[in-house]
């Protein structure tokens, strides 16, 4: 796979190190409508512009080039949008779930500045999503149609193509750790939690069982205490079932021991309650009692993310 | 030229699990995805999965969860499919695909699998 | 699930005279300024044979006599004129969404 730029490198000696271009059997097709400008079939309201990626795009502002094209290749044509839109892939790209994310999903939201569009490449977006999508559903959330890599190019036509392969070399091991079970240490990332959830639920768990890839957690008959109801109906919560997607086979430190109460938190996601956080009931933990007292009052992000969890790998 | 052989036809027993197979050759194998598609006698083309052999991905048909398992052999550039708890409806003809730049433009011969006690 | 219906289901038509087959999705196929919609053709005992990429692109080695031709929803192939060996199965497929789809075939009989 190609050796390609690191993020001091200059805009055009980048792009060129990274773009895979050889004519191949894709070349009898005119490479299948990729290279049409504008877009075939889409007429925008404006003409292609560039711009500088603003520094409040965090998603792609370190991406390691300084000037984006807007729309974008995911059609949108401001920058509010787009930065609305990227905002919710921040906590994806926390995880470092694969150390080219970012040249992706930029690839998409600030693509490149050129006088045509350039796509990532498929394998690109196949990396990415084996090392990210597995984490995504664990949250509930699909990976998005839009992203569905086999509408990207082929390697060997011109296209944005894997950079790193994995994680860089400097970056710390990532634990196996449930991605549900990543703690956050902070009252305020304990309370961004609580916004991203639908339902948060003091309980005890009578019993875990393994499901399909899946643990399950059986909440105790008594002693819950509902500090935030969302979507739960009575059914729900006379018989707490959560579902921790692909939570079998990864460790979950606190659910070592089911002695005691847990601070769980989930989404209703097609009828099944998937849980996105658990913590064991601490009352002498500080932050967590402040966490649950003013959870309400928090002003929450008015954007809520593909997916919640730890901001960074423990 | 891009070939796709699949495995011989199978007559297998109701409750039984079949695997087959599909070898690619004349190109990269790790490049196309390789669907597989299903087609009852007389009916018409039913879409099951695909799999990116370049990462593994798996791509299935909430349909044919649990019924199909989709795996490649990059060392043998050899994708294969299980199909699991076989009914009379499994009896088909089973169609590996490869899906190259933007469409499934390589196509197997069919793999006849027969259930039947 | 996007749902592709084919019209009509079945067609007799003359050697020599143009045969059209529609396509429709139950909602729109298109993405990246590209509408994900294929055809192709199918004999007995054969594996499908592909027509049309990306709604109206003819692939390599198919006589111009087929194109294709719509967007979003809409979707329609064109045989023109018909030959005797056009005699088969048609079947559209969309890839814009997961999880693929095929549209329920059309057989066309040459008169």
């Known amino acids: 796979m190609w050796v390609a730029w690191s993020a001091r490198t200059a805009a055009l000696a980048l792009l060129l190190g990274a773009l895979h271009g050889a004519p191949t059997r894709g070349q009898e097709y005119d490479y299948y409508g990729w290279q049409a400008e504008p877009l075939h079939g889409r007429s925008y309201s404006k003409p292609p512009q560039c711009l500088d990626i603003p520094a409040d795009l965090p998603l792609c502002h370190t991406v390691g080039y300084k000037r984006m094209r807007l729309p974008n290749l995911l059609e949108h044509e401001s920058l509010a949008e787009v930065k609305q839109q990227a905002s919710s892939w921040l906590p994806l790209l926390a995880k470092r779930c694969h150390s080219d994310t970012q040249v992706f999903l930029c690839s998409l939201f600030a693509p490149v500045c050129l006088d045509r569009p350039i796509y990532p490449c498929r394998s690109l977006c196949e990396a990415a999503r084996a090392g990210c999508a597995p984490l995504m559903e664990a949250y509930g959330f699909p990976w998005p149609e839009m992203l569905h890599c086999h509408k990207f190019p082929l390697d060997n036509d011109l296209c944005i193509a894997v950079q790193f392969g994995h994680l860089p070399a400097t970056a710390p091991p990532v634990t196996k750790i449930c991605a549900q079970c990543e703690m956050e240490h902070s009252a305020d990332g304990l309370m961004e939690q609580m916004c991203s959830s639908d339902f948060v639920v003091k309980m005890r768990i009578k019993e875990i069982k393994i499901d399909n890839g899946d643990r399950k957690l059986i909440g105790a008959q008594k002693k819950k205490k509902l500090l935030k109801a969302g979507p739960l109906k009575r059914k729900d919560t006379k018989k707490l079932v959560l579902h921790m997607k692909n939570g079998a086979s990864c460790p979950c430190p606190q659910l070592d021991n089911l002695t005691g109460s847990f601070l769980v938190m989930g989404r209703k996601v097609e009828g099944q309650l998937l849980l996105t956080a658990v913590y064991r009931w601490d009352k002498k933990n500080k932050e967590m009692k402040f966490a649950v007292k003013f959870m309400f009052s928090y002003p929450c992000s008015l954007y809520y993310p593909f997916f919640y969890g730890a901001a960074e790998p423990h | 030229q891009v070939q796709l052989t699949q495995s011989g036809a199978e007559l297998v027993r109701p409750g039984a699990s079949v695997k087959l197979s599909c070898k690619a050759s004349g190109y990269t194998f790790t490049d196309y995805y390789i669907n597989w598609v299903k087609q009852r006698p007389g009916q018409g083309l039913e879409w099951i999965a695909r799999?990116?052999?370049?990462?593994?991905?798996?791509y299935y048909n909430e349909k044919f969860k649990g019924k199909a398992t989709l795996t490649a052999e990059k060392s043998s550039s050899t994708a294969y499919m299980q199909l699991s708890s076989l009914t009379s409806e499994d009896s088909a003809v089973y169609f590996c695909a490869a899906y190259s730049a933007s469409a499934m433009d390589y196509w197997g011969q069919g793999t006849s699998v027969t259930v039947s006690s | 699930n996007v749902v592709l219906t084919q019209s009509p289901a079945s067609l007799a038509v003359s050697l020599g005279q143009r045969a059209t087959i529609s396509c429709r999705a139950s909602?729109?196929?298109?993405?990246?300024?590209?509408?994900?919609m294929y055809w192709y053709q199918q004999k007995p005992g054969q594996p499908p044979k592909l027509l049309i990429y990306l709604a109206n692109n003819l692939e390599s080695g198919v006589p111009a006599r087929f194109s294709g031709s719509g967007s979003r929803t809409d979707f329609t192939l064109t045989i023109d004129p018909v030959e005797a060996d056009d005699a088969a199965s048609y079947y559209c497929q969309q890839n814009n969404e997961d999880p693929w789809t095929f549209g329920g075939g059309t057989k066309l009989e040459i008169k």
């Open positions: 909602e729109s196929v298109d993405s990246y300024g590209k509408s994900f």
């Open positions: 799999i990116y052999p370049g990462s593994g991905n798996t």
